[in-house]
């Protein structure tokens, strides 16, 4: 058993049929010695008396809020949560496996630039009685500070018969140099509590590997005289690291109709303009990627050909 | 401690082309190592990230763009002085700081060159003949060093009398290639910045 936060404890259980469970001793936080009784959750049934209560925690029915009283007055609470371990593996029931970029990916993180600011998100089908707490650091043995905000519900989607909820959190490394060469990864730890179930999820990454620039901005078209070609120009996104001559981007320019199966014109360039062939009912799209370290491409920025 | 804005004309900067070739060569070599050594811990997640130039050179700090010198987190206290007569400095007005930056890059290359050559000598003794260093990568390191053209004491190639542990050597190769790729990215950024300034 260990303390998650004040008055909240996590009991780690090997989860299999007829498992013996864990013996837990609860102590009432009071100077009183006599006349103390214990109850669980909203029940008025007295579970025991005395300053300490010993219980055998085997299942979720044994978890919950234990309260010690004296003469009708509440003295203190202890909330017991269960963390299940099945076949030596901690349960991952609360969050959905996003399976990208690999299986067992529960947390996904992205950074728009090298400032040390990043966003992580996760998915769940659970809508109520759900709380998250996020911690982060650079390295684990001698951790350096990363400050994370509160996790918030950022999107709701309908997937078949199920509703899917996306939560996200923003974090900022306390003293980040955009030009630094990372040798210790960022560690992100998410504590998830659903009703009386506790789970924890972790992710470890270098900022350089989770970079995904915002799409290029200010796309403009200029038709070329006596030609089917148009010159398309754009600018670096505002959120990208500066100076741009140091943090350079490379771009992919594509002309395509509405369907992905349609024919297209595609060209890659390090410049902020390119010449392409525009077709009726097609769109010109441009996306960006770090020129020197190939992490993710940005989403497309698009303008219609006409 | 930082790069000044007054630097050579764009077309006058011979190191940019070499630095692009360097990043390409080390990226290709790393990809080859990851494929060939698929049963070894050779991915970014699996290896320890070591920097053989740590406390010996200060490339990131010495080559910091002017715009980032306002960022306290970028200003480390490390200072290293180097010889200042490189041929990439196409302008006589080029400041001492830029010379410091380019000579720091030169020292990085020299250190990695020695390590890679020593490692290759060991890998050539491996009866499995599983992996060798790409001669093109070694040649590209050499070309960039020549373009930088700094006078520097030659570092003797390390020779080892004991029988090499080929497993350890291959893991060290992965560690070295990952670190060198990161440094090559920094070098490319620096050259691009200098070329544009």
């Amino acid at each position: 058993i260990w303390e998650l936060k004040k008055d909240v404890y996590v009991v780690e259980l090997d989860w299999y049929p007829d498992a013996p469970g864990e013996m837990v001793v609860l102590t009432c936080d009071t100077p009183e010695e006599d006349g103390i009784t214990w109850t669980l959750d909203q029940s008025s049934e007295v579970l025991g008396s005395g300053k300490t209560l010993t219980i055998q925690v085997k299942e979720f029915g044994d978890a919950g809020q234990y309260t010690c009283h004296k003469g009708g007055e509440v003295l203190s609470h202890s909330l017991l949560l269960l963390h299940k371990k099945e076949d030596g593996i901690w349960s991952t029931d609360i969050l959905k496996d996003q399976k990208e970029p690999k299986n067992k990916t529960f947390l996904r993180c992205e950074a728009k630039n090298y400032s040390g600011r990043f966003t992580c998100w996760w998915l769940t089908t659970i809508s109520t009685d759900l709380t998250f707490s996020v911690k982060s650091s650079r390295g684990s043995s001698d951790p350096q500070g990363v400050t994370c905000g509160a996790a918030t519900l950022s999107a709701e989607r309908v997937r078949g018969d199920n509703k899917e909820y996306e939560y996200s959190v923003e974090c900022q490394e306390d003293s980040a140099c955009p030009a630094a060469e990372e040798s210790l990864p960022i560690e992100v730890m998410v504590d998830a509590v659903h009703k009386l179930k506790y789970e924890n999820y972790t992710s470890s990454f270098f900022i350089r590997d989770i970079i995904k620039p915002d799409p290029p901005k200010n796309l403009q078209l200029k038709p070329l005289k006596n030609s089917r070609q148009v010159e398309v120009s754009w600018e670096y996104p505002d959120t990208w690291s500066t100076p741009h001559s140091y943090f350079s981007l490379t771009f992919c320019v594509q002309v395509q109709g509405k369907s992905k199966r349609e024919k297209k014109d595609r060209v890659f360039t390090d410049k902020t303009s390119a010449t392409v062939i525009c077709r009726k009912n097609a769109s010109i799209s441009v996306r960006a990627q770090d020129r020197y370290y190939s992490s993710s491409w940005s989403e497309w920025a698009s303008v219609p050909c006409s | 401690r930082n790069l000044p804005v007054a630097t050579p004309d764009p077309g006058m900067f011979p190191c940019l082309h070499h630095s692009q070739n360097l990043l390409r060569a080390v990226s290709n070599m790393l990809q080859k190592a990851r494929q060939t050594l698929e049963f070894y811990p050779c991915t970014s997640e699996e290896i320890d990230h070591e920097d053989i130039t740590k406390d010996k050179t200060s490339t990131v700090e010495a080559c910091l763009p002017l715009e980032l010198t306002k960022n306290e987190s970028c200003l480390n206290s490390r200072e290293t002085s180097f010889i200042t007569n490189g041929s990439c400095l196409a302008s006589r007005k080029t400041s001492f700081m830029m010379a410091l930056c380019l000579s720091s890059i030169y020292e990085d290359l020299k250190m990695y060159q020695v390590e890679f050559k020593t490692m290759n000598a060991k890998l050539l003794m491996d009866p499995k003949r599983q992996i060798f260093l790409d001669q093109n990568m070694l040649a590209v390191i050499d070309e960039l060093m020549q373009a930088l053209n700094f006078n520097s004491e030659t570092v003797p190639q390390k020779s080892s009398l004991e029988e090499p542990d080929f497993y350890k050597t291959k893991i060290k190769l992965c560690i070295l290639l990952h670190a060198f790729r990161i440094r090559a990215v920094t070098i490319d950024r620096v050259m691009s910045y200098l070329n544009a300034s």
Epitope: V267, F268, T269, R279 | -
Partner: antibody, heavy 118, light 107 residues
Framework: QVQLVQSGAEVKKPGSSVKVSCKAS????????LHWVRQAPGQGLEWMGW????????EYAPKFQGRVTITADESTSTAYMELSSLRSEDTAVYAC???????????WGQGTLVTVSS | DIVMTQSPLSLPVTPGEPASISCRAS??????LHWYQQKPGQAPRQLIA???QSISGVPSRFSGSGSGTDFTLTISSLQPEDFATYYC?????????FGQGTKVEIK
């Protein structure tokens, strides 16, 4: 199986014109750009131009501008390349090639040898 | 027009050995570079798109690298069926242009 089948070899006099055909099978004809590339004996490849069969848009290499005409007939899934004012240096194998991507080629025709000789 | 220069023009190689062909552009073309293989009397066959993207059905021994002005096609271990002429082609701008070709011959 996508295939491009070209018309047979031709022998032409200098100053005359030649029209080579390229019939596509497999896949929808208008879903691809169609190019013409030539190769003189013992020489390399030389791009001549492209057509979008969907709308008849064309683009020609400056070297052939005014002398080459590329057309397409959607009803027969056939593209044509006509080269006029032939000279002996136009003796080459002319090949059609196609792709959904405009600027490179994934399927090629077998080539048509055009010999220009007096 | 962008001029593509291949080297060497002729490359004698022992079967089983690796081979590398270089292609240089007269100006920077990013990764807009494609490789083709042509055997005598046959149409060219696409090997690599956009400098390094492998093409479905092409053996993994063929790989491409490069960006800007310098590109390389590498055949890791030459098989008898690989003896042919190889062409690079730029798609950065029109007119599309090819290298002169490199003939890979049996040593």
């Amino acid at each position: 199986q996508v295939q491009l089948v070209q018309s047979g070899a031709e022998v032409k006099k200098p100053g005359s014109s030649v029209k080579v055909s390229c019939k596509a099978s497999g896949g929808t004809f208008s879903d691809y750009y169609l190019h013409w590339v030539r190769q003189a004996p013992g020489q390399g490849l030389e791009w001549m131009g492209w057509i979008d069969p969907e709308n008849g848009d064309t683009e020609y290499a400056p070297k052939f501008q005014g002398r080459v005409t590329i057309t397409a007939d959607e009803s027969t899934s056939t593209a044509y390349m006509e080269l006029s004012s032939l000279r002996s240096e136009d003796t080459a194998v002319y090949a059609c090639a196609r792709n959904k991507e405009l600027r490179y080629f994934d399927v090629w025709g077998q080539g048509t040898l055009v010999t220009v000789s007096s | 027009d962008i001029v593509m220069t291949q080297s060497p023009l002729s490359l004698p190689v022992t079967p089983g050995e690796p081979a590398s062909i270089s292609c240089r552009a007269s100006q920077s073309i990013s990764i807009n570079l494609h490789w083709y293989q042509q055997k005598p009397g046959q149409a060219p066959r696409q090997l690599i798109a956009f400098a390094s993207q492998s093409i479905s059905g092409v053996p993994s021994r063929f790989s491409g690298s490069g960006s800007g002005t310098d590109f390389t096609l590498t055949i890791s271990s030459l098989q008898p069926e690989d003896f042919a002429t190889y062409y690079c082609q730029q798609s950065n701008s029109f007119p599309l242009t090819f290298g002169q070709g490199t003939k890979v011959e049996i040593k």
